[in-house]
């Protein structure tokens, strides 16, 4: 009986530790996509609707804030698209990029953790164009550090929740 009690306590401890593991999945807020044709920061994301969820992390001022030290897997998926019904592209040669950036408040500094993308020729003769970028990586993050997303040509972003999103989840503690 004692072993049973010990076992169930162990399960509960494991489960509560898992439930406390920080994670976030943020989806683009299509009503507030910034404008610009150069690199701009995307600051408007959903954290609590549709596929978007957050636990033991904070979303504030367009940045995902780490609350617990640890090793985290970070990911971002950005889709760009253009359909002729929305008008013409002013230039057919495009650089479509995403940058995942870490900002430290304690020691004011900013580092690009990941970037992805390509130069594209989107011919005006085509009705529809689409391009997707997915980046992911394993990073040591400290409490208080902030993760943000920058993209080129935000007017071409696909606003769907299954197209443009980013997130993080803690994999293990820092020894």
């Amino acid at each position: 009986e004692k072993a049973m009690v010990d076992g169930s306590w162990l399960d509960l401890a494991k489960r509560s530790k898992l439930e406390a593991q920080p994670f976030a999945h943020l989806t683009i807020n299509a009503t507030d996509i910034p404008s610009g044709s150069h690199k701009v920061s995307l600051s408007s994301w959903y954290h609590d609707r549709g596929w978007a969820k957050i636990s033991n992390m904070t979303f504030s001022n367009g940045k995902l804030i780490v609350n617990q030290d640890g090793f985290y897997y970070l990911y971002a998926n950005i889709c760009f698209r253009h359909h002729e019904t929305s008008g013409d592209l002013a230039t057919e040669y495009l650089q479509l990029m995403v940058y995942v950036t870490k900002t430290s408040i304690k020691i004011p500094s900013s580092h690009t953790l990941m970037k992805g993308g390509s130069t594209k020729y989107w011919s005006g003769n085509s009705e529809f164009h689409f391009y997707s970028i997915n980046v992911g990586g394993f990073f040591k993050l400290r409490s208080g550090e902030e993760i943000s997303i920058e993209v080129s040509n935000p007017s071409l972003l696909d606003p769907d929740q299954d197209a443009t999103y980013f997130g993080a989840f803690k994999v293990r503690d820092i020894d």
Epitope: S35, G36, S37, H82, E84, T85, S86, G87, D88, L89, A90, T91, E92, L94, N153, P154, S155, L156
Partner: antibody, heavy 126, light 103 residues
């Protein structure tokens, strides 16, 4: 305030060319595209082409391809539309219009014409 | 190529009347539809963009609605200065125009 001022009326013989100017003021000329639209007597408005005033990129209606040239002089904040091999059906009022989508805000030419020139009547007659 | 069709081609109404003009696209164009007012000898004027957004400086009696392939321009209370021809437009295609006159 934003203004587009076009050159005056022109009369041409069939086979000739005409060049219409459109001088912009009140905004950063290079940040917007300029469209050219015409209206022949009793006809609907007809889109002819656009020029991205920033980089000079152009796009034309298939109908005018080969006989239209659109250029711009950024220093003078002026766009020009030249139509060659004129025929009587080209008799129309020609308008320039600004695309409302600023290039600094994105790279899509949205076809919302928020400011127009007063129009230039081109008459083609022998 | 998308074709825009307006109806009616002309209409006559009294001052204060509610006037409705319809524009149909030959295929779905989402909400990428604009309305313009043309008066003889004057520069055309953008009234509505994106199907329902009122252009700055345009009187609130003008409104637009619709999405997909069917759109409407409404003048809630016709004024003498509204005598003009109205055109719908999607990118490179314009409707044939609706001439509005006062009875």
């Amino acid at each position: 305030q934003v203004q587009l001022v076009q050159s005056g009326a022109e009369v041409r013989k069939p086979g000739a060319s005409v060049k219409v100017s459109c001088k912009a003021s009140g905004y950063d000329f290079s940040n917007y595209a300029i469209h050219w639209v015409r209206q022949a007597p009793g006809q609907r408005l007809e889109w002819m082409g656009w020029i991205n005033a920033g980089n000079g990129n152009t796009k034309f209606s298939q109908k005018f391809q080969g006989r239209i040239t659109v250029t711009r002089d950024t220093a003078a904040s002026t766009a020009y539309m030249e139509l060659r091999s004129l025929r009587s059906e080209d008799t129309a009022v020609y308008y320039c219009a600004r695309d409302s989508s600023a290039m600094v805000r994105g790279i899509i030419i949205a076809y919302y014409f928020d400011y127009w020139g007063q129009g230039t009547l081109v008459t083609v007659s022998s | 190529e998308i074709v825009m069709t307006q109806s009616p081609s002309s209409l006559s109404a009294s001052v204060g009347d509610r006037v409705t003009i319809t524009c149909r696209a030959s295929q779905s164009i989402s909400r990428y539809l604009n309305w313009y007012q043309l008066k003889p000898g004057k520069a055309p004027r953008l009234l509505i963009y994106g199907a329902s957004s009122l252009q700055s400086g345009v009187p609130s009696r003008f409104s637009g609605s619709g999405s997909g392939a069917e759109f409407t321009l409404t003048i809630s209370s016709l004024q003498p200065e509204d005598i003009a021809t109205y055109y719908c437009q999607h990118t490179r295609a314009f409707g044939q125009g609706t001439k509005v006159e006062i009875k």
